[in-house]
Interface confidence: medium
């Protein structure tokens, strides 16, 4: 995300009252049929060609519907604001036939004191203010309405919520004489949901709260609160689920300890500890009760908060996440890495894998990367032969079937997909790595050698000769 290169003031508009009926307006279809790709998996190309041809033939009837853009809506309740007091908002693209709603929380690190928030405001204002937001955004990856790009939920109502609160979506404090900045991430989510109820969300069957990076952590922090909010507002039938991408961090020991000077070098536990106080941060109630006062920072870490959540959550996490490595003071500068660092990186993958062992719905490829779900090529990566959209489809089915008391995993439809090979990019479907300085693409063999991996050590556990392994990796097998 860009971030890597990175109350109420007074009584305002009430939320739209709950509808007495959730029926669609006259002439609107009740629900389009979601596509189940199970039957066509063997012949997906031909199926996609047919879908495309159908879409093109219908284009003149509904050109507006095929427009990829999500349109900006600034919150009508302008007291719910970005850091600088400008109104928060959301981008929306409706899909009138669908009762699925995808709400995506953007990521982009955070700031946790006046100094680094001032610096963030100077260098990354878009992440602290709505002042220069474009009027439209194109939906990509899981936010795309094209079946080819988004075979999972292409027909859903798409909502992109820009991150402008710098608080990992946890804050609940407004701008005042005392506070130079507002931190209202948790309130922004609540207000967006309230406004969307008047725009059709009231008739939803499923609300999927998704997010990447800080937005992924935001999902873990807010998913239960959204479910509770909808229940209180009179919509208990809406099933709330979470999809946390690249937001499952470890509070592990840094590779090299540094003082807490700025966002990047500060150990995550210390940054969050300071941040919570600065933001007036809120964490899920059931998690908060597990820790003493002043220890709420624990709830920002996936493996600690996840067991306390009531809503189903699907966790997507690269085993070698670049943001995790950054806060651990691992900087891959282009120089071959020393053995100590190589072991640290491998151990990180092992630790992460361990935290996911009791997460039934998870997708964790052994790649060095960050964020995936709104990338256009999010369908390309596979774990054990299964792509992420396919795994999400299986998750949907398992949740649907679990209402019928079936607890066994669906045959041929896995949802727990965690790579077991032990080094970065040992999964050949990982995104291409580029040399940081030349920008040249590196194949896996080049990358591993560059990382200082001894081919003998890597090849032996596989029962291979180093030359055989290099050949396999170079061919992408």
């Amino acid at each position: 995300s860009e971030g890597r290169k990175t109350w109420r003031r007074r009584g305002q508009q009430p939320p739209p009252p709950p509808r007495t009926e959730a029926a669609p307006a006259a002439g609107q279809p009740v629900e389009s049929f979601p596509l189940d790709f199970t039957a066509v998996e063997g012949n997906m190309d031909s199926f996609m060609a047919q879908v495309k041809s159908l879409a093109q033939s219908l284009y003149p009837c509904s050109a507006q519907q095929l427009n990829e853009d999500l349109r900006l809506h600034l919150l009508l309740n302008t007291s719910v604001t970005c850091n600088d007091g400008s109104p928060a908002g959301y981008y929306l693209k409706e899909s009138r036939g669908s009762r699925r709603w995808l709400l995506f929380l953007e990521g982009g690190w955070y700031c946790f004191n006046r100094e680094n928030c001032d610096s963030r405001y100077d260098t990354m204002r878009r992440l602290m203010s709505s002042r220069d937001w474009p009027r439209t955004r194109t939906g990509t990856g899981i936010l795309s309405s094209q079946p080819e790009e988004n075979p999972y939920w292409w027909n859903a109502n798409m909502v992109f919520i820009p991150y402008c609160s710098s608080d990992v979506w946890s804050g609940a404090s407004s701008k005042s004489e005392k506070n130079e900045y507002a931190f209202m991430g948790a309130l922004i989510i609540q207000e967006v949901v309230r406004e969307l109820l008047g725009r059709g969300l009231s008739g939803a069957k499923v609300l999927l709260l998704a997010g990447s990076s800080a937005g992924g952590t935001g999902v873990l922090l807010n998913v239960d609160r959204v479910a509770e909010q909808l229940e209180k507002l009179g919509y208990p039938a809406i099933q709330v689920r979470g999809l946390a991408d690249s937001g499952w961090f470890l509070d592990n020991k840094q590779y090299r300890h540094t003082d807490c000077v700025d966002t990047i070098t500060c150990a995550p536990t210390e940054a969050i500890r300071r941040g919570i106080r600065y933001w007036n941060g809120v964490v899920p109630e059931r998690c908060r009760r597990q820790f003493q006062e002043g220890e709420e920072w624990n709830c920002f870490f996936g493996y600690k908060v996840y067991p306390t959540l009531r809503c189903p959550v699907f966790v997507v996490q690269w085993l070698f996440d670049e943001a995790q490595l950054t806060v651990d003071n691992v900087h891959l500068t282009g120089q071959p890495v020393q053995e100590g660092l190589r072991l640290y990186i491998q151990n990180l993958g092992r630790e992460l894998r361990h935290t996911l062992k009791d997460v039934p719905a998870s997708f964790a490829p052994a790649c060095l990367s960050h964020e995936i779900i709104i990338r256009s090529h999010w369908t390309d990566v596979q774990v054990k032969g299964t792509s992420l959209p396919r795994a999400l489809h299986c998750w949907d089915r398992s949740l649907h079937d679990s209402h019928k008391a079936s607890k066994t995993p669906l045959k041929g439809c896995p949802v727990h997909l965690v790579d077991s090979c032990p080094w970065p990019h040992c999964n050949p479907s990982c995104p291409t790595v580029r040399d940081q300085f030349t920008g040249q693409e590196m194949n896996v063999a080049q990358f591993l050698m560059h990382m200082g991996f001894d081919m003998q050590t890597v090849a032996q556990p596989q029962g291979l000769e180093p030359s055989e392994l290099l050949g396999m990796l170079s061919n992408g097998s």
Partner: antibody
Framework: QIQLQQSGPELVKPGASVKISCKAS????????INWVKQKPGQGLEWIGW????????KYNEKFKGTATLTVDTSSSTAYMQLSSLTSEDTAVYFC???????????WGQGTSVTVSS | DIQMTQSPASLSVSVGETVTITCRAS??????LAWYQQKQGKSPRLLVY???NLADGVPSRFSGSGSGTQFSLKINSLQSEDFGTYYC?????????FGGGTKLEIK
């Protein structure tokens, strides 16, 4: 293209009521708030209130509570404002305007002139 | 309620000149402000939203600036079609009050 078409001029007696309409076209009516604005002859603009056609939710300027009532008919994509117990102070042009989601009133009706006179 | 004070109330300018109209809010409204142009006998037309953004179809000689309590609308190289009355309006909680207007006349 997007249009808000208002009903024609009205001449009414003091104490009576009047209902003016604003028919929307060119966009999905239930998605946008409709605001009403008053302009007395030779004077400035005054915000009366809004209605959200998606669910009938309303918000009024305290000054107009009790005199203005906002309603919608979604089947005809029409917003209405009823003004009751009229006095000469209510002689004005009344505009409907769409709230465009970006802190703005982006499309306006042509205005309806209401004259209160005995 | 928030008061919006516009100045000047009127001004007389020649074609080709540059003019700036200001609007002051009685409290901090951040960027929650719009500018409109109204010609005699017509409905208002949106020029600027969220303090600084030009609405579709508005010529680039118009520009909005400011945030907090002080805002301005600048018109460079005035054209004959720019004459009329200009209003600011806040959107920081209801009621959404308008400024008193600035009447721009041809000299």
């Amino acid at each position: 293209q997007i249009q808000l078409q208002q009903s024609g001029p009205e001449l009414v007696k003091p104490g009576a009521s009047v209902k003016i309409s604003c028919k929307a076209s060119g966009y999905r009516f239930t998605d946008y708030y409709i605001n009403w604005v008053k302009q007395k002859p030779g004077q400035g603009l005054e915000w009366i209130g809004w209605i959200y056609p998606g669910n009938g939710n309303t918000k009024y300027n305290e000054k107009f509570k009790g005199t203005a009532t906002l309603t919608v008919d979604t089947s005809s994509s029409t917003a209405y404002m009823q003004l009751s117990s009229l006095t000469s102070e209510d002689t004005a042009v009344y505009f409907c305007a769409r709230y465009g989601n970006l802190l703005d009133l982006d499309y306006w009706g042509q205005g309806t002139s209401v004259t209160v006179s005995s | 309620d928030i008061q919006m004070t516009q100045s000047p109330a009127s001004l007389s300018v020649s074609v080709g000149e540059t003019v700036t109209i200001t609007c002051r809010a009685s409290e901090n409204i951040y960027i929650n402000l719009a500018w409109y142009q109204q010609k005699q006998g017509k409905s208002p037309r949106l020029l600027v939203y969220a303090a600084t953004n030009l609405a579709d179809g508005v010529p680039s000689r118009f520009s909005g600036s400011g945030s907090g309590t002080q805002f301005s609308l600048k018109i460079n190289s005035l054209q004959s079609e720019d004459f009329g009355t200009y209003y600011c309006q806040h959107f920081w909680g209801t009621p959404y009050t308008f400024g008193g207007g600035t009447k721009l006349e041809i000299k």
